[in-house]
Interface confidence: low
């Protein structure tokens, strides 16, 4: 029986050219997390495997940084980055949990409070 729940950053917005942190957390279960996949629509962005660590998709390696934690940092945002992002937790013995985040990337003049930072 799957008892866990995923908390996410929900619907977020950021400035074009800026950066954003996507974070999810799996709670209310004792299941072991074996791998977390980060996907944008149907594209695989990154994998964090419990044994093998992080793997960033080569097509995103210049703009995606692992962390913090099991989260993902998107840098040098473009308007084309707008859309749904999914954190997919593969667990044992529960199975798969999925969290959804919607990111809207705004033109600089529109996003008055966009995040302006870089992950070292």
């Amino acid at each position: 029986m799957m008892t866990g729940t995923i908390e996410t950053t929900g619907n977020i917005s950021a400035e074009k050219g800026g950066s954003i942190i996507l974070q999810c957390h799996l709670s209310s279960t004792t299941a072991q997390v074996t791998q977390v996949n980060w996907e944008q629509q149907d594209q695989l962005l990154a994998i964090c495997n419990a044994d093998l660590g992080w793997h960033i998709s080569p097509s995103f390696k210049d703009r995606v940084a692992p962390g913090p934690g099991l989260g993902l940092t998107l840098q040098s945002l473009t308007v084309n980055d707008t859309g749904e992002y999914f954190c997919i937790y593969h667990t044992y013995p529960d199975g798969t949990y999925t969290g959804r985040i919607f990111l809207e990337v705004l033109e600089s003049s529109v996003a008055e409070h966009g995040a302006r930072f870089q992950i070292p």
Epitope: E7, T9, I21, H25, S27, H113, G114, A115, F117
Partner: nanobody
Framework: EVQLVESGGGLVQPGGSLRLSCAAS????????MGWFRQAPGKEREWVAS???????WYADSVKGRFTISADNSKNTAYLQMNSLKPEDTAVYYC????????WGQGTLVTVSS
């Protein structure tokens, strides 16, 4: 109106400790994300730590094991306990309201020097 006010910065010797506070108002503190960032002179602002409702925490590798982020919902305040400080921790420290970290405080200066 969302307001974030940092305090607790100052001059400390290497190896010393400081506790930064971020008093928040104008939003549902207990249901949001909070983060600490820092900006050293001439450098980009960088993420330090963040905390999710429920107390889940994340840290940059450079501060892991030395810094602790926490939040007191009853006081609408977030904290950053900084131990074993190093000269390279010298920076202006900012707290930010979570989700897209879309609101920022004015910052508090931390100087680590002998």
């Amino acid at each position: 109106e969302v307001q974030l006010v940092e305090s607790g910065g100052g001059l400390v010797q290497p190896g010393g400790s400081l506790r930064l506070s971020c008093a928040a108002s104008g939003f549902a503190f207990s249901s949001d994300w909070m983060g600490w960032f820092r900006q050293a002179p001439g450098k980009e602002r960088e993420w330090v730590a963040s905390v999710l409702r429920g107390g889940y925490t994340w840290y940059a590798d450079s501060v892991k094991g030395r810094f602790t982020i926490s939040a007191d919902n009853s006081k609408n305040t977030a904290y950053l306990q900084m131990n074993s400080l190093k000269p390279e921790d010298t920076a202006v420290y900012y707290c930010a309201r979570g989700e897209g970290f879309d609101y920022w405080g004015q910052g508090t200066l931390v100087t680590v020097s002998s």
